[in-house]
Interface confidence: medium
């Protein structure tokens, strides 16, 4: 089942997805698509990276984190109700049938009439269940964190802080994460 993330109309939504490159600069292709992860690739692709760079993107969709270090979390700019739905983060690990697929559900709420007085930092406190599986080819051991139910009602104000703050580490520990190598 998909894990739910929330944002308000007009804000930026954040959908976490991470992997740890086997070596610095040894990147794995990743795609983001609107809709559940299909059999192959990502349906309705909104952003894609290759072994070097972001090679395809559409307006309003971008990677705010350092994708060269495996932070391929998706930011959706200025969301509307139409942005609600399931998004697929697919980490395309080399090897036979080795891809890792994460379905993330984005719920967009109408904007509040009055602005919230304080920033919302109420992340679900549960630690993810960790699962170690034996991979194929270059992916020796893969550690997958299950996704928490994260409530981000004021994403736009947090977006810049996420990169350097302890919050970013919390997200990395509890988001869609796969370690390669």
């Amino acid at each position: 089942s998909e894990v739910e993330y929330r944002a308000e109309v007009g804000q930026n939504a954040y959908l976490p997805c991470f992997y740890t490159p086997a070596a610095p600069g040894n990147l794995v292709p990743v795609c983001w698509g609107k809709g559940a992860c299909p059999v192959f690739e990502c349906g309705n692709v909104v952003l894609r990276t290759d072994e070097r760079d972001v090679n395809y993107w559409t307006s309003r969709y971008w990677l705010n984190g350092d994708f060269r270090k495996g932070d391929v979390s998706l930011t959706i700019e200025n969301v509307t109700l139409a942005d609600s739905g399931i998004y697929c983060c697919r980490i395309q690990i080399p090897g036979i049938m080795n891809d890792e697929k994460f379905n993330l559900k984005l719920v967009i709420k109408p904007a509040k009439v009055t602005p919230a007085p304080t920033r919302q930092r109420d992340f679900t406190a549960a630690f993810p269940r960790m699962l170690t599986t034996r991979g194929h080819g270059p992916a020796e051991t893969q550690t997958l964190g299950s996704l928490p139910d994260i409530n981000l009602t004021q994403i736009s104000t947090l977006a810049n802080e996420l990169r350097d703050s302890r919050l970013a580490n919390d997200l990395r520990d509890s988001g869609a994460t796969i370690r390669i190598g």
Epitope: P29, C37, V39, F40, C42, G43, D50, I96, N98, D99
Partner: antibody
Framework: QVQLVQSGGGLVQPGGSLRLSCAAS????????MSWVRQAPGKGLEWVSA????????YYADSVKGRFTISRDNSKNTLLLQMNSLRVEDTAVYYC????????????WGQGTMVTVSS | NFMLTQPPSASGTPGQRVTISCSGS????????VNWYQQLPGTAPKLLIY???QRPSGVPARFSGSKSGTSASLAISGLQSEQEADYYC???????????FGTGTKVTVL
């Protein structure tokens, strides 16, 4: 112009081998899964095999499993189908197709190439 | 090989609406999206509908798709002679790990 151009069909005896090729142009080849679909004379469409954009994942119809091998060379924008131990029932027009949706939404097709297996 | 079930033929007069059914199971249509293809005589198939009800650019609005449970259907409204063709439904099957086509329906304009 987005297109797929096929080559490599022909006449072969039962038990023989053939290799089909599909050259892609006009799009980022490595970003798409690709499939082979065949159609026997006067019959319907039959999916044969599929391969992910990176080449890491492959799938086969039971009727060709162990005999056919799908592969791709992303540096040359080429999709391949190596067909071994061919049988009379493999006689068909073979199409390569681009899967733009990941769910088998084949939006671009090759022109088709005839493979005839006969003694 | 397993195939989705379609009626072998369907027909209508010009301007009429024709509907083609496609029956499957929980492991294919019930779990995954359905695509529809049109194949004119002597040509490669053409994608008409993807993801149950989406039309690729260039496909006229007279073609529409729907899905309910383990069945899907394709409707052609305002039937024209150029729509005489074979129509195939298709879906991924999770049990077989195969992409399965329908048996095909030949549409005739009377």
């Amino acid at each position: 112009q987005v297109q797929l151009v096929q080559s490599g069909g022909g006449l072969v005896q039962p038990g023989g081998s053939l290799r089909l090729s599909c050259a892609a142009s006009g799009f980022t080849f490595s970003s798409y899964a690709m499939s082979w679909v065949r159609q026997a004379p006067g019959k319907g469409l039959e999916w044969v095999s599929a391969i992910s954009g990176s080449g890491g994942s492959t799938y086969y119809a039971d009727s060709v499993k162990g005999r056919f091998t799908i592969s791709r060379d992303n540096s040359k924008n080429t999709l391949l189908l190596q067909m071994n131990s061919l049988r009379v029932e493999d006689t068909a027009v073979y199409y390569c197709a681009r899967d733009f949706s990941g769910w088998g939404g084949f939006d671009i097709w090759g022109q088709g190439t005839m493979v005839t297996v006969s003694s | 090989n397993f195939m989705l079930t379609q009626p072998p033929s369907a027909s209508g007069t010009p301007g009429q609406r024709v509907t083609i059914s496609c029956s499957g199971s929980s492991s294919n249509i019930g779990s995954n999206t359905v695509n529809w293809y049109q194949q004119l005589p002597g040509t490669a198939p053409k994608l008409l509908i993807y993801s149950n009800n989406q039309r690729p650019s260039g496909v006229p609005a007279r073609f529409s798709g729907s899905k309910s449970g383990t069945s899907a259907s394709l409707a052609i409204s305002g039937l024209q002679s150029e729509q005489e063709a074979d129509y195939y439904c298709a879906a991924w099957d999770d049990s077989l790990n195969n992409y399965v086509f329908g048996t095909g329906t030949k549409v005739t304009v009377l």
